[in-house]
């Protein structure tokens, strides 16, 4: 099979790290500096990715694999293969077109990326709020009043914060 395939297409024998060179009668040529081919049978080598600016090099390029980038501190990767770097925000914030903004009341974000999400609605599950939510943390739902049998110690709800749903600053 290999012999048949190579007779049909000599390029199929060119391994990773090489390309099938039309300028050399289709013999396999090693990839030139700062280029790579990660699979066999390639007709060109791809230029190595350069991690510049807000990107930093996580893995150097080689003749058989591309460089891999991540983001400098204060930024995080977005997209396949870290194609973009997005600014980090603090917990309790989300990134908008105007920069990092605090989560609106009733929403939270416990990460440095992503959007603010609504607090869990405990009553939808027939439960009560055990711990109030904050900008950084979701509410903690407790057992429903019906779950507490007579005589069982009930959980005293926390004192309300000055701004409902937020911890005192």
């Amino acid at each position: 099979f290999e012999r048949t395939r190579s007779l049909q297409d000599p390029c199929s024998n060119c391994p990773a790290g090489t390309f099938c060179d039309n300028n050399r009668n289709q013999i396999c040529s090693p990839c030139p500096p700062n280029s790579f081919s990660s699979a066999g049978g390639q007709r060109t080598c791809d230029i190595c990715r350069q991690c510049k600016g807000v990107f930093r090099t996580r893995k150097e390029c080689s003749s058989t694999s591309n460089a891999e980038c991540d983001c400098t501190p204060g930024f995080h990767c977005l997209g396949a293969g870290c194609s973009m770097c997005e600014q980090d925000c603090k917990q309790g914030q989300e990134l908008t077109k105007k920069g990092c903004k605090d989560c609106c009341f009733g929403t939270f974000n416990d990460q440095k990326r992503g959007i603010c999400r609504p607090w869990t609605n405990c009553s939808l599950d027939g439960k009560s709020v055990l711990v109030n939510g904050t900008k950084e943390r979701d509410v903690v739902c407790g057992p429903s009043p019906a779950d507490l049998s007579p005589g069982a110690s009930s959980v005293t709800p926390p004192a309300p914060a000055r701004e409902p749903g937020h911890s005192p600053q």
Epitope: P30, C31, S63
Partner: nanobody
Framework: AVQLVESGGGSVQPGGSLRLSCAAS????????SAWYRQAPGKQRELVAW???????HYADSAKGRFTISRDNTNKTAYLQMNSLNVEDTAVYYC?????WGQGTQVTVSS
């Protein structure tokens, strides 16, 4: 002019060894890949072993486990140590660096 000059070819019996050398003039070894090719009569020239630009050695399937490529940048010389030679290894062996080719050295394996 930049030149590559091979040496070390010859006749050897099956199972024998040879060490090919490729001496370069000029400054190409610090820039380009070093590679060894071979061409048997009536066949296309094929890549046998090469040191890539990232200084990693690579081998064609036919050379793996038997051939070793190395390079001495100080002496501007590349080497191909060939062990366990068999009749199919008979060919003219060429040194290559970038666009520069050596004149070739004959390797003949026969009993």
């Amino acid at each position: 002019a930049v030149q590559l000059v091979e040496s070390g070819g010859g006749s050897v019996q099956p199972g024998g060894s040879l060490r090919l050398s490729c001496a370069a003039s000029g400054n190409i070894f610090n820039i380009h890949v070093s590679a060894w090719y071979r061409q048997a009569p009536g066949k296309q020239r094929e890549l046998v072993a090469w040191i890539a630009w990232d200084n990693v050695a690579h081998y064609a399937d036919s050379a793996k486990g038997r051939f070793t490529i190395s390079r001495d940048n100080t002496n501007k010389t590349a080497y191909l140590q060939m062990n366990s030679l068999n009749v199919e290894d008979t060919a003219v062996y060429y040194c290559n660096s970038g666009d520069i080719w050596g004149q070739g050295t004959q390797v003949t394996v026969s009993s």
